[in-house]
Each structure stands twice: as structure tokens, then as C-alpha cells.
């Protein structure tokens, strides 16, 4: 998982998906950063089924899954006046091949060739009210909500850190938006995939 | 706009059974995010459970394993099964409502279940 560092005017929050932004009428697009598969507990089912980039018979090769989870936005001592509710990106994109094992005779399912990762694609902003102890006034924040899941590609440029979206040659590149920081916490929770569609 | 209420509380004794249901009103119900939230006397509300349209779910720990969600969208209904049930069950349940990716703006107003031991 991809340690960030804090910058001033952000606040991380508990999951990887959900973090404050600016009070803004508009805010740029995240820059397409690699997502943690081990995040909220105990989702299961997972939504929507996942995307089928590759022409293959064999579905279950693909698990980019949307896993929805439900809780209340903390920032430190303060937390949201009502819960929320949204999407965990989970699994591994693209087809897993059988490659032989080294140590034993037995084959191991590894991925091969281009790196894909499942990652949020779509966000909703969506304002919250922090209560905070102490006989705080509450504060009024924009959280950004997980909406959509894709398969991106993770390229050589940027220091690996641009991804490109499933079947096409360049990442397309977003007009007068610059990508901007995001504060993440570190710690997160194990999802569960149970039963998964 | 969705209304809910609840139902189905009551007295239950340790390691007993109830069955919640959040009723709904109002044609755009199949969309919503639904979840059972609780609120034991002197604590903040928690998370229980939750369910989207179609059918993925979400448990928070204190009931997995023991609770269960589901729901009947051509009944506009959403039901949380509770087995095996314990006194610190007991609580103020609220089932609430939510756009996907979005604030649970909605809410009935409770159900109370109690757990005598």
C-alpha cells in the first residue's frame, strides 16, 4: 500500500477511498493512484459484476469488484453526523495465466503481462456534518464517495503512477485539471469477499 | 421521497430470535442503499448492516455471522434477521436510506430490542 504524505488544507480519513476536499465549487479529478485491495471489512457480495476487458469464455478470471461498505466519516476526534454509504474496489484485473511452479511440481495462478489494477474510477461529492466533542461547533466538510470501480493500466510513466483505462493506447488527458494530492491513511481494514457475483 | 418505518422489536431473551422490517414508501425505494443502524442507551448510533438494489452487502462485526439482511424490492421492504441475540444487543434499531455513494439522509423512526439475559 502506497504511504502518502499529508499536505496542508487535507484531512485523511480511516477508509482509502473516502477523503475530505477543498470547499470548492469544482475539484479536479484524483490522479489515478493505485488503490489498496485490503480495505473495508466485511463486504460482501460484491455489486456489480466486474468488467470484461479481455474477449475470454472464462469470467471468473476478472475481479474488479465493487464492494459497497456503510459508516460514519471521522476526522480525528470528530465524526459525521450521518453515516455514508460506498464502493470498495477489490481484486486484480485482467486474466490470470497458469505458470509453472519453480519449488514443487505444481503451477501457480500468476498474472502476466500488462499491469492492471481495479481501482475507483467515479466519485460523488457529498457534503457532511462533523460533530466534535468538546462543545465544538459542527463543521461542514465535502467528503468524496467512491461511485464506480474500472480496470486501469498501470504505465511506465510518472513513476508508475499513471494508469490507463482498459483498451485504449493513452491515458486521455483531462483539460485545465492538474492532479492534486491525496491524503490517505494507512490503516485499513480487510475486505471479505464472500459469495461474490 | 422515501419514508420508512420500522418494525418487528421487542423483549427477546438471550440467544433468541427477531426479525426487523423496514417498510418503504415512494416509487424510487429499489435505488436506495438501505441500512439498520442502532443506538444503545448512553452510546453514539452504529452501523449494523446495510444492502444495496441489488442485493450486495455490508456487516458491521458486532452481527456478522449472527445478523442478516435482505431485502424484497417488489415489496418495498428490508428485513434484518437476528439470531443467537445478547444483552448488549439491546438498542434503539433505525433502518435509513441512502443514494448510492451518498449520505444516509432518510431515516424511520426505531424499533426498540431488547435483550434481557
Known amino acids: 500500500h502506497h504511504h502518502h504524505h499529508h499536505h496542508q488544507g487535507w484531512q485523511a480519513f480511516k477508509n482509502d477511498a473516502t477523503e475530505i476536499i477543498p470547499e470548492l465549487g469544482e475539484y479536479p479529478e484524483p490522479p489515478p493512484e493505485l488503490e489498496n485491495n485490503k480495505t473495508m471489512n466485511r463486504a460482501e457480495n460484491g455489486g456489480r459484476p466486474p468488467h470484461h476487458p479481455f474477449e475470454t469464455k472464462d469470467v471468473s478470471e476478472y475481479s474488479c469488484r465493487e464492494l459497497h461498505f456503510t459508516r460514519y466519516v471521522t476526522d480525528g476526534p470528530c465524526r459525521s453526523a450521518k453515516p455514508v454509504t460506498e464502493l470498495v474496489c477489490s481484486g486484480q484485473c485482467g486474466p490470470a495465466r497458469l505458470l509453472p511452479n519453480a519449488i514443487g511440481r505444481g503451477k501457480w495462478w500468476r498474472p502476466s503481462g500488462p499491469d492492471f489494477r481495479c481501482i475507483p474510477d467515479r466519485y460523488r461529492a457529498q457534503r457532511v456534518q462533523l460533530l466534535c466533542p468538546g462543545g465544538e461547533a459542527p463543521r461542514a466538510r465535502k467528503v468524496r464517495l467512491v461511485a464506480s470501480c474500472k480496470c486501469k493500466r498501470l504505465t511506465r510513466f510518472h513513476n508508475q503512477s499513471e494508469l490507463k483505462d482498459f483498451g485504449t493506447e493513452a491515458a486521455r488527458p483531462q483539460k485545465g485539471r492538474k492532479p492534486r494530492p491525496r491524503a490517505r491513511s494507512a490503516k485499513a481494514n480487510q475486505a471479505e469477499l464472500e459469495n461474490a457475483y | 421521497e422515501v419514508q420508512l418505518v420500522e418494525s418487528g422489536g421487542g423483549l427477546v431473551q438471550a440467544g433468541g430470535s427477531l426479525r426487523l422490517t423496514c417498510a418503504a414508501s415512494g416509487r424510487t425505494f429499489s435505488s436506495f442503499v438501505i441500512g439498520w443502524f442502532r443506538q444503545a442507551p448512553g452510546k453514539q448510533r452504529e452501523v449494523v448492516a446495510s444492502?444495496?438494489?441489488?442485493?450486495?452487502?455490508y456487516y458491521e462485526d458486532s452481527g456478522k455471522g449472527r445478523f442478516t439482511i435482505s431485502r424484497d424490492n417488489a415489496k418495498n421492504r428490508v428485513y434484518l434477521q437476528m439470531n443467537s441475540l445478547r444483552p448488549e444487543d439491546t438498542a434503539v434499531y433505525y433502518c435509513a436510506a441512502a443514494e448510492p455513494a451518498g449520505v444516509y439522509d432518510v431515516w424511520g423512526q426505531g424499533t426498540q430490542v431488547t435483550v434481557s439475559s
Open positions: 444492502i444495496t438494489s441489488g442485493g450486495s452487502t
